[in-house]
């Protein structure tokens, strides 16, 4: 008997850049022997329904498709037939098939591999334009893919345990695309410092499918107006 | 890191008062406001009443006003909170807490106040 | 003052179940509630904020919802480090108030 195991859960993150491992794990009731099977590794783009192959090992050849594409013949041995893709970009995400021939048995899994590129976030002050004691933050996030993403504020007074989000006075604008793929969005919050007490904290918060924790960026209003003392967590994806 | 010491037990008799204190490190002490809690097993938590740093202000839930005296010496970053005419009902877990300068909320370990004769 | 009420004192759950300890306000508190996990021994510990966002580093499995009145903590594949009591809190306006407390226990 014969089988194939991928990732569970059917999908694989990376991000951008990465040098990535596809993973696959072949199960065979016999010891196998590396010069009489045939590993085929294909790809299915997201944009369109054609397979292509990706690399290929059969007994003492193989051949990489795309370039640096690699299977470990020394893990092989093991039952490993990972195909690991250094460079990993954005255009390359959508289904691998990893098929696998121990003559006459044959077996195959698939698994969609997502790309996925972590945003920078930074913190700027606009008083351009704007009246006193008005104050205008931009919170600027920048080369992040998938496009989807969540900009919230938020603050923190002196007195109150915990933030509050604020949700008047906040414009976030539509997402651009990059030449590379990725996308930037800014995210505006006006405030009146009179109105605010000396001490609260404000925060930027910004979620992303490539983010284990949020990313934020704050700033405290103080007495003499406001210091923009800003703490990123760039505690992304690995 | 934000970091609350308190005492771990005190043993006072009903009728005497006590002091219980709350040392804050690892942030700026005076820019914030510092809330006492007290904890009852099985009777939840209560605000007992809260102290800016700077020791401009001060405000009580109506509960424990009379109870409880909130005052800070900022030369050692400590808070107290007096507790005069003890009864058996002020034996309970007493924490002190507050924002620091991140988000979220610190708590102290809280001090176990038992009132026996 | 601002009643919190959570009515259930225990539940009963098993490891790897799914769990939902609820909140009900004696008056509209927006988002503006906190919930906390409390393990024997020790300080309470926040878990979620402003009805429904995590603290950094509290595991994904703690989800809060609601809104208003209505508040509900879920845990899902509950682990044996998660049975201990859970606290709802209101930060709309002092006095701060806090639920009763719901103790998780295994089934």
């Known amino acids: 008997d014969l089988k194939v195991e991928m990732m569970a859960g059917g999908t694989q993150i990376t991000p951008l850049n990465d040098n990535v491992t596809i993973f696959c794990n072949i199960f065979y009731s016999q010891p196998l022997n590396i010069t009489s099977m045939g590993i085929t590794w294909f790809w299915k783009s997201l944009t369109f329904d054609k397979e292509v192959k990706v690399f290929e090992f059969f007994g003492d050849h193989q051949e990489a498709f795309r370039p640096g594409a690699i299977v470990s013949p020394w893990r092989l041995k093991s039952g490993d037939a990972s195909l690991r893709l250094p460079g990993i970009q954005l255009e390359e995400a959508g289904e691998y098939r990893c098929e696998v021939v121990v003559t006459p048995l044959k077996a195959q899994g698939t698994v969609q591999l997502e790309v996925v590129a972590s945003p920078a976030s930074r913190l700027l002050l606009d008083q351009v334009g704007m009246k006193e004691n008005e104050d205008k933050y931009m919170c600027e996030s920048s080369g992040f893919y998938p496009e989807a993403i969540n900009i919230t504020w938020e603050k923190q007074t002196q007195k109150f345990p915990h933030p509050i989000e604020i949700s008047e006075d906040v414009i976030t604008g539509p997402t651009i695309k990059n030449m590379d793929g990725t996308f930037n969005v800014t995210s505006c919050l006006k405030l009146n410092s009179s109105q605010e007490d000396p001490g609260t904290v404000y925060q930027c918060v910004v979620r992303h499918a490539s983010l284990h924790t949020p990313l934020r960026s704050n700033f405290t209003l103080t007495a003499a107006r406001h210091s923009l003392s800003e703490t990123e967590k760039t505690d992304n994806f690995s | 890191q934000v970091q609350l010491q308190q005492p771990g037990s005190v043993l006072v008799r009903p009728g005497a008062s006590v002091r219980l204190s709350c040392k804050a490190s690892?942030?700026?002490?005076?820019?914030?406001?510092m809330n006492w809690m007290k904890q009852r097993p099985g009777q939840g938590l209560e605000w007992i009443g809260g102290i800016y740093l700077n020791g401009d202000s001060t405000d009580y839930n109506e509960k424990f006003k009379g109870k409880a005296t909130l005052t800070v010496d900022t030369s050692s970053s400590t808070t107290y909170m007096d507790l005069s005419s003890l009864t058996y009902e002020d034996s309970a877990v007493y924490y002190c807490?507050?924002?620091?300068?991140?988000?979220?909320?610190?708590w102290g370990q809280g001090t176990t106040l038992t009132v026996s004769s | 003052d601002i009643v919190m009420t959570q009515s259930q004192k225990f539940m009963s759950t098993s490891v790897g179940d799914r769990v939902s300890v609820t909140c009900k306000a004696s008056?509209?508190?927006?988002?503006?509630v906190a919930w906390y996990q409390q393990k024997p021994g020790q300080s309470p510990k926040a878990l979620i904020y402003?009805?429904?966002n995590r603290y950094d580093g509290v595991p994904d499995r703690f989800t809060g919802s609601g809104s208003g009145t209505d508040f509900t903590l879920t845990i899902t594949n509950v682990q044996s480090e998660d049975l201990t009591e859970y606290f709802c809190q209101q930060y709309i306006s002092y006095p701060l108030t806090f639920g009763a407390g719901t103790k998780l226990e295994l089934k």
């Open positions: 402003s009805a429904s």
């Open positions: 807490t507050t924002r620091g300068d991140y988000f979220g909320d610190f």
């Open positions: 008056q509209n508190v927006g988002k503006y």
């Open positions: 690892g942030y700026t002490f005076t820019n914030y406001w």
